[in-house]
């Protein structure tokens, strides 16, 4: 992800007696929470791989970049970062790999400058629809978030409690239309089988969308038409068989787009003809010369760009009266 790393060379370590500070007390100017490292010069606090079970209450007010990775947080309650005075400068928050399984409504409230949030590598079985919007109003106050990194947040299959994981994530992205300003969204490695059709239309500012390493079979009902600012679309390592005319036309119509399609099991039959024609003409697909057929068996490993219409046939479907069992 693109969360910032600190350029600071000197970090002050915490004093044990500071661990008991409470959020209602204004932090001391040079205070650093227990088990964290702080650099006021770099406006950075790192509490990394320390098995923290809660967000420290005594974060310094100057913090702009906060790393809380590799901990044991489990739950982010409402107002997990609400402080008096507020953490008004906090712009980048990395919570990856902290064993979070529950993020409650309003978890990121009172962070007026928060632009980058990374929740990757947490098994988010319970992501509140209002985790990012903070309220259940039909239209919420706009979130300042510009970059949201949600790679590998899918819990184990037996822990999804019969809910649609895709639906849960999308509900959080769309609630209250709070994320209208979002420019980067990463949803890689989440076992997504489908993309709910309304999600992209409601994120009109997107520049970068990463859906790589999922299980997407089709984009037939997904519309990219409104994403006029989209610059990169990562669809590598999915289960895509073919892209149909409607999708091809929409992608071609996006002025700045680069599309990444490597490592999909393309089915090279008669339905692939339009896509092959498009690939030969388009400049939007990066590494298009690497795309190869996976099926049918006779076409395996053939390069899509080298196919012609004679190669792309469909076995005739026998009428029912002629079919054998």
């Amino acid at each position: 992800s693109s969360s910032p790393t600190s350029s600071a060379s000197s970090f002050s370590s915490s004093a044990p007696f500071l661990a008991s500070a409470v959020s209602a007390q204004p932090p001391l100017p040079d205070q650093c929470p227990a088990l964290c490292e702080c650099s006021e010069a770099a406006r950075t606090v790192k509490c990394v791989n320390r098995n923290l079970t809660e967000v420290p209450t005594d974060l310094p007010a100057y913090v702009r970049n906060l790393f809380l990775t590799g901990n044991q947080l489990a739950v982010l309650p409402a107002g997990a970062f609400a402080r008096r005075p507020p953490l008004a400068e906090l712009a980048a928050l990395n919570l990856s790999g902290s064993r979070l399984d529950e993020v409650r409504a309003g978890a990121f409230e009172h962070l007026p400058s928060l632009r980058q949030l990374d929740l990757s590598h947490n098994p988010l079985a319970d992501l509140s629809p209002f985790a990012f919007s903070g309220s259940n109003a039909s239209v919420s106050a706009p979130s300042p978030l510009v970059e949201l990194i949600l790679n590998h947040i899918v819990p184990p299959e037996d822990e999804r409690q019969n809910r649609s994981f895709e639906g849960m994530v999308v509900a959080a992205l769309l609630a209250g239309r709070a994320l209208q300003g979002l420019r980067r969204l990463e949803l890689a490695s989440n076992h997504f089988l489908y993309l709910p059709r309304d999600v992209l239309a409601q994120l009109p500012s997107l520049r970068h969308l990463d859906l790589s390493n999922n299980s997407l079979v089709s984009l037939t009902y997904v519309s990219f038409r409104n994403l006029t600012h989209l610059e990169s679309l990562h669809l590598e390592d999915n289960a895509l068989k073919v892209l149909h005319n409607g999708t091809l036309a929409e992608l071609q119509g996006l002025p700045h787009i680069r599309v990444f399609l490597d490592n999909n099991p393309w089915v090279c039959d008669c339905h692939m003809a339009d896509m092959v024609t498009w690939l030969k003409e388009t400049e939007v697909v990066q590494g298009k010369d690497r795309l190869t057929c996976a099926y049918p068996e006779k076409m395996r490993n053939r390069v899509l760009l080298e196919l012609n219409s004679a190669d792309l046939d469909c076995d005739p479907i026998l009428p029912p009266s002629l079919q054998t069992s």
Epitope: T53, S98, R99, L100, D101, E102, D126, P155, E159, Q161
Partner: nanobody, 122 residues
Framework: EVQLVESGGGEVQPGGSLRLSCAAS????????MAWFRQAPGKEREFVAA????????RYAESVKGRFTISRDNAINTVYLQMNSLKSEDTAVYYC???????????????WGQGTLVTVKP
């Protein structure tokens, strides 16, 4: 209501080890956290360790950090407490509990087992 059944208690010498088990009658989906508490004679029940069913996050009381390890096996709805370097002050009845919160308070947990006695003496 979930039935929680502890086992594995017994008598052990200082410095020895024991492994406690807590079997849940069914997976308590409403209870996201499993914990161990203990109660020594004449003292209040105190938090020992907790684990989340899903993410596997763990937390420990300061008095047992580095000596005790909590773990869970989701496939058989069982939580374990591996206790090493036991001390006489670890003598207590150990209770398994299930709850929603990620907390250390008695009131964070709604379902309780009957307890298993651990005695540490020379």
């Amino acid at each position: 209501e979930v039935q929680l059944v502890e086992s594995g208690g017994g008598e052990v010498q200082p410095g020895g080890s024991l492994r406690l088990s807590c079997a849940a009658s069914r997976r308590p989906f409403s209870s996201k956290t499993m914990a161990w508490f203990r109660q020594a004679p004449g003292k209040e029940r105190e938090f020992v360790a907790a684990v989340r069913w899903i993410g596997g996050a763990t937390r420990y009381a300061e008095s047992v950090k580095g000596r005790f390890t909590i773990s869970r096996d989701n496939a058989i709805n069982t939580v374990y407490l591996q206790m090493n370097s036991l001390k006489s002050e670890d003598t207590a009845v150990y209770y398994c509990a299930a709850g929603q919160a990620w907390g250390t308070k008695f009131t964070d947990y709604s379902d309780w087992g009957q307890g298993t006695l651990v005695t540490v003496k020379p």
